[in-house]
Interface confidence: low
């Protein structure tokens, strides 16, 4: 538990006086005195304060720099910061999502297990027996080998994790 303080919750101590903190979305203009209340002013446009505070300046909303692959996920208010996310095909490099990197592609022989999001990279998995992927892709799953039998054909070349089977006509014995 927090150590007890001289003032109540949402108050601060100054000059032996307990003053009210400014509410979220407002900044401190002047401290209270024995005779006057704390004076607060709303944050300007593109500014915010997200806690009960005694800040004399509001914080600037985060700028989602398109040059870093960022876009606005949630517009900031006077009480909340802007939330940035990454453009389609990119994901954040850090906790604060301050820049983005391209999603990883899954190499041939691997398929996408989980498509990337704005905050997590592509998860790849090896194509198991019976499946293949012949492309490098951030979206393609492993595809099942073609079933030659259902086409009344036979396997002429076995499939691998990177290639499909090759089907061909059945050899028919002549009478």
């Amino acid at each position: 538990p927090e150590p007890p303080t001289a003032c109540r919750e949402k108050q601060y101590l100054i000059n032996s006086q307990c003053c009210s903190l400014c509410q979220p979305g407002q900044k401190l203009v002047s401290d209270c005195t024995e005779f006057t209340e704390t004076e607060c002013l709303p944050c300007g446009e593109s500014e915010f304060l997200d806690t009960w505070n005694r800040e004399t300046h509001c914080h600037q909303h985060k700028y989602c720099d398109p040059n870093l692959g960022l876009r606005v996920q949630q517009k900031g208010t006077s009480e909340t910061d802007t939330i940035c996310t990454c453009e389609e095909g990119w994901h954040c490099t850090s906790e604060a999502c301050e820049s983005c990197v391209l999603h990883r592609s899954c190499s041939p022989g691997f398929g996408v297990k989980q498509i990337a999001t704005g905050v997590s990279d592509t998860i790849c998995e090896p194509c198991p027996v019976g499946f293949f992927s012949n492309v490098s892709s951030a979206f393609e799953k492993c595809h099942p080998w073609t079933s030659c039998e259902t086409k009344d054909l036979v396997v002429q070349q076995a499939g691998t994790n990177k290639t499909d089977v090759v089907c061909g006509p059945q050899d028919r014995l002549r009478a």
Epitope: H59, K62, T93, S94, E95, A96, E98, S99, V101, Q114, S120, D121, I123
Partner: antibody, heavy 114, light 106 residues
């Protein structure tokens, strides 16, 4: 409360490998990245890399790409860092730190000496 | 790689004095984070996102700055504040730390 407890000090021969562990408790392990940081004797801090335990995504400082391998075991809430081809220059304290760096392990001293 | 240069390398002050530590980045960063480290201990987060006080950190610590120039201020040094302080950026991979400023007793 959140705790990161690292494995004990290690003394290793040049050329060998070492695996340092970092057991997390007090929070949901898969919700936060785990970073690793190195501090050589009397030196500053160097970021090695991190792992996202929810999907095993790793990101490395290029300097440590061929030196360190970071893994995580969700079943035991433990992150690991293996250092290979050890040299005397790898002698350092290695720290794990939770995403955002508010919580750090106590550090593991790895000494490389013949 | 963004290089963080801290100055001064050593700051000799007395308890009660004000300490001003600087961190200069080789390229612009969105935020700067600050840590305190004492001998034999792990670093401790003091300030995150340039100016936000980490949990449990006394209000005598404050951070400011933007772009490439950032400052950690300790308004009135207490005996327990004598330690090494590091700045740290998470804006660009690889994440980097400054070389540290040692605040020692004069």
């Amino acid at each position: 409360q959140v705790q990161l407890v690292q494995s004990g000090a290690e003394v290793k021969k040049p050329g060998s490998s070492v695996k340092v562990s970092c057991k997390a408790s007090g929070y949901t392990f898969t919700n936060y990245w785990m970073h690793w940081v190195r501090q050589a004797p009397g030196q500053g801090l160097e970021w090695i890399g991190y792992i996202n335990p929810s999907n095993d995504y790793t990101k490395y400082n290029q300097k440590f790409k061929d030196k360190a391998t970071i893994t995580a075991d969700e079943s035991t809430n433990t992150a690991y860092m293996e250092l290979s081809s050890l040299r005397s220059e790898d002698t350092a304290v290695y720290y794990c730190a939770r995403q955002g760096f508010p919580y750090w392990g106590q550090g593991t001293l790895v000494t490389v000496s013949s | 790689e963004i290089v963080l240069t801290q100055s001064p390398a050593t700051l000799s002050l007395s308890p009660g004095e004000r300490a001003t530590l600087s961190c200069s980045a080789s390229s612009s960063v969105s935020y700067m984070h600050w840590y305190q480290q004492k001998p034999g201990q792990a670093p401790r987060l003091l300030i995150y996102d340039t100016s936000k006080l980490a949990s449990g950190i006394p209000a005598r610590f404050s951070g400011s700055g933007s772009g490439t120039d950032f400052t950690l201020t300790i308004s009135s040094l207490e005996p327990e504040d004598f330690a090494v302080y590091y700045c740290h950026q998470l804006s660009s991979d690889p994440f980097t730390f400054g070389g540290g400023t040692k605040v020692e007793i004069k």
